[in-house]
């Protein structure tokens, strides 16, 4: 059995240039793998679409924080 977890590399090459309303967002994933050209966030929308966004943008960081709080509050 392998001693480390192997995950397929997902990269963002382009990021969305407009804000996504928070109520449309379901979850996010951080992309920090150095084999990717830039650090990014992949938002999953409630319709199942995945969108790359730039974590340097304020709305992206605020959305991540909002989703963190929602998921924390859902925990038993």
């Amino acid at each position: 059995q392998p001693d480390s977890v192997s995950i397929p590399i997902t990269c963002c090459f382009n990021v969305i240039n407009r804000k996504i309303p928070i109520q449309r967002l379901e979850s996010y994933t951080r992309i920090t793998n150095i084999q990717c050209p830039k650090e990014a966030v992949i938002f999953k929308t409630k319709r199942g679409k995945e969108v790359c966004a730039d974590p340097k943008e304020r709305w992206v960081r605020d959305s991540m924080k909002h989703l963190d709080q929602i998921f924390q509050n859902l925990k038993p």
């Epitope: 650090e39 974590p55 340097k56 924080k65 963190d68």
Partner: antibody, heavy 117, light 107 residues
């Protein structure tokens, strides 16, 4: 692969300033934030501040505000940290590190700064 | 500022032991917690981010858990190369702060 290579060790007098450099390869520094973290001998880690090299925006721990300057030169992929009004308590290893999200996945090798009269 | 309290500050263990290190924040940090390993004379190495996400290449014997203000790093079966100092760090809000560290020594 990513490398952050820092400048060499420094010995400084109290009251003087030190400037440490951090040259990045294998990444575009304007795509990330560059942070500075220090570690006094035998002590823990202490975040000092960070810069967004794309626009020069900085954020600092208030403890260091006014005494630390962080700059970046995207043309040479180098970040700099200057600490002024040095005192003996500033004797530490200073690290640069990268990360947009507030955690640090790549670190420099560290630069030892000794403040002694 | 958010303060991070790590315990124990040191522990002695043997190869094969299960080791648990805890970290407590002074306020909810919503899983924005990282764990690092540091060996003498070296820079810290990121093990876990987001409280539970193992970094690529980090052995699966390392795991993170917790929520709210309380978080745990577990090494399921301690290996010789795991003797080091471990730090937690919150990245919920700047200034980002670290725990005081836990030194894992050979018993």
């Amino acid at each position: 692969q990513v490398q952050l290579v820092q400048s060499g060790a420094e010995v400084k007098k109290p009251g003087s300033s030190v400037k440490v450099s951090c040259k990045a390869s294998g990444l575009t520094i304007s795509d990330t934030y560059m942070h500075w973290v220090r570690q006094a001998p035998g002590q823990g880690l202490e975040w000092m501040g960070r810069i967004d090299p794309a626009n020069g925006n900085t954020k600092f721990d208030p403890k260091f505000q006014g005494r630390v300057t962080i700059t970046a030169d995207t043309s040479t992929s180098t970040a700099y940290m200057e600490l002024s009004s040095l005192r003996s308590e500033d004797t530490a290893v200073y690290y640069c590190a990268r990360g947009v999200f507030g955690f640090f996945d790549y670190w420099g090798q560290g630069t030892t700064v000794t403040v002694s009269s | 500022d958010i303060q991070m309290t790590q315990s124990p500050s040191s522990l002695s263990a043997s190869v094969g032991d299960r080791v648990t290190i805890t970290c407590k924040a002074t306020e909810d940090i919503y899983n924005r917690l990282a764990w690092y390993q540091q060996k003498p004379g070296k820079a810290p190495k990121l093990l876990i981010s987001g409280a539970t996400s193992l970094e690529t290449g980090v052995p699966s014997r390392f795991s993170g858990s917790g929520s709210g203000t309380d978080y745990t790093l577990t090494i399921s079966s301690l290996q010789p190369e795991d003797f080091a100092t471990y730090y937690c760090q919150q990245f919920w809000s700047a200034p980002y702060t670290f725990g005081g560290g836990t030194k894992v020594e050979i018993k």
